[in-house]
């Protein structure tokens, strides 16, 4: 769920995810739309389809609640849980890694991006 | 190979707590990813999931029961334990332990069942 | 919480004859598991991850299905296939089973 994923991107990334990427750009945080602003966003972006597709397999992606481990700078998702439990965190691992990979493109002028300024087709999943 | 066995009290009556063992070999619960379910049938009926302890001690419950279940075990001794407190009638049952082993959603191994009775 | 409703709850079938076991869920589930018991013993595992049989089990066995509806099959039926046999999801927490489908031989 929510606090699982916080608690990941925290720990991989380093950065605060309230105060980082809740939101940033057209897709970090709720919803989303229009073209990404960069490949932070891009990230934002792919998790949203991740979770989209969980959804169509009937998973509660917001209250599922599942294991993993993180060590030396790795994240292990638990083999415990539910099918839905374990996709949801493999969702989430991927989007922290995704948001580490680009810490150094990050754009601080992209933080509470003002929505209605997200244009373009919106890329399908 | 893998067994498991249950044992149990037989009978017991209404409101008392309701203490089940499950003795297993072939397998360590000390073994990363391991674990063992209890799930009960009652007499003619269908199949119902109690609970679930896992290698490392974390423990999962049936919702509809959890604040009468608790789950535990002894790694050293290859055992599993489930209390059920203030049983009633509706607890009586064939009770199994159930083997989950690795990223297994289902349960590949099964005890024979020890059968409680609960008396009025 | 994931219900899961067989049918038929009871059967019969002739030797030889084709036999379908429906198992309905009542939202999307990834696998479905079947197990297969017979009276006085313990279930066993029948068939994982929708169609794979488990060790043992016959040929004229089959799984199928996806989304919210799966079903356990037997080409030809024979006498010791007379059982009951449960459906099981462990797709969202916590896992559950069916009522079970009571198959006879006639």
């Known amino acids: 769920g929510i606090l699982n994923l916080n608690k990941m991107v925290k720990q991989v990334t380093g950065k605060m995810p309230i105060l980082s990427y809740w939101p940033y750009g057209c897709h970090c945080g709720l919803g989303g739309r229009g073209q990404p602003k960069d490949a932070t966003d891009w990230c934002c972006q792919t998790h949203d389809c991740c979770y989209d597709h969980l959804k169509t397999q009937g998973c509660s992606i917001y209250k599922d609640y599942y294991r993993y481990n993180f060590s030396q700078g790795n994240i292990h998702c638990s083999d415990k849980g539910s099918w839905c439990e374990q996709q949801l965190c493999a969702c989430d691992k991927e989007v922290a890694f995704c948001l580490k990979r680009n810490l150094d493109t990050y754009q601080k002028r992209l933080r509470f991006y003002w929505r209605p300024h997200c244009r373009g087709q919106t890329p399908g999943c | 190979q893998v067994t498991l066995k249950e044992s149990g009290p037989g009978i017991l009556q209404s409101s008392q707590t309701l203490s089940l063992t499950c003795s297993f070999s072939?397998?360590?619960?000390?073994?990363?990813?391991?674990?063992v379910s209890w799930i009960r049938q009652p007499s003619g009926k269908g199949l119902e999931w109690l609970a679930h302890?896992?290698?490392?001690?974390?423990?999962r419950y049936n919702p509809s029961l959890k604040s009468r279940l608790t789950i535990s075990k002894d790694t050293s001794r290859n055992q599993v334990f489930l209390k059920i407190s203030n049983v009633d009638t509706a607890d009586a049952a064939t009770y199994y332990c159930?083997?989950?082993?690795?990223?297994?959603?289902?349960?590949?191994?099964w005890g024979t069942g020890t059968t409680v009775t609960v008396s009025s | 919480q994931i219900v899961l409703t067989q049918s038929p709850a009871i059967m019969s079938a002739s030797p030889g004859e084709k036999v379908t076991i429906s198992c309905s869920a009542s939202?999307?589930?990834?696998?479905m598991y079947w197990y297969q018991q017979k009276p006085g013993s313990s279930p066993k595992p029948w068939i994982y991850?929708?169609?794979n049989l488990a060790s043992g089990v016959p040929a004229r066995f089959s799984g199928s299905g996806s989304g919210t509806s799966y079903s356990l099959t037997i080409s030809s039926m024979e006498a010791e296939d007379a059982a009951t046999y449960y459906c099981?999801?462990?797709?969202?927490?916590?896992?559950?089973f069916g009522g079970g489908t009571k198959l006879e031989i006639k």
């Open positions: 939202s999307s589930v990834s696998y």
């Open positions: 302890i896992y290698w490392d001690d974390d423990k």
């Open positions: 072939g397998f360590s619960l000390s073994t990363s990813s391991m674990g």
């Open positions: 099981q999801q462990y797709h969202t927490y916590p896992p559950t």
């Open positions: 991850r929708t169609s």
């Open positions: 159930a083997r989950r082993a690795g990223n297994f959603f289902y349960f590949d191994v």
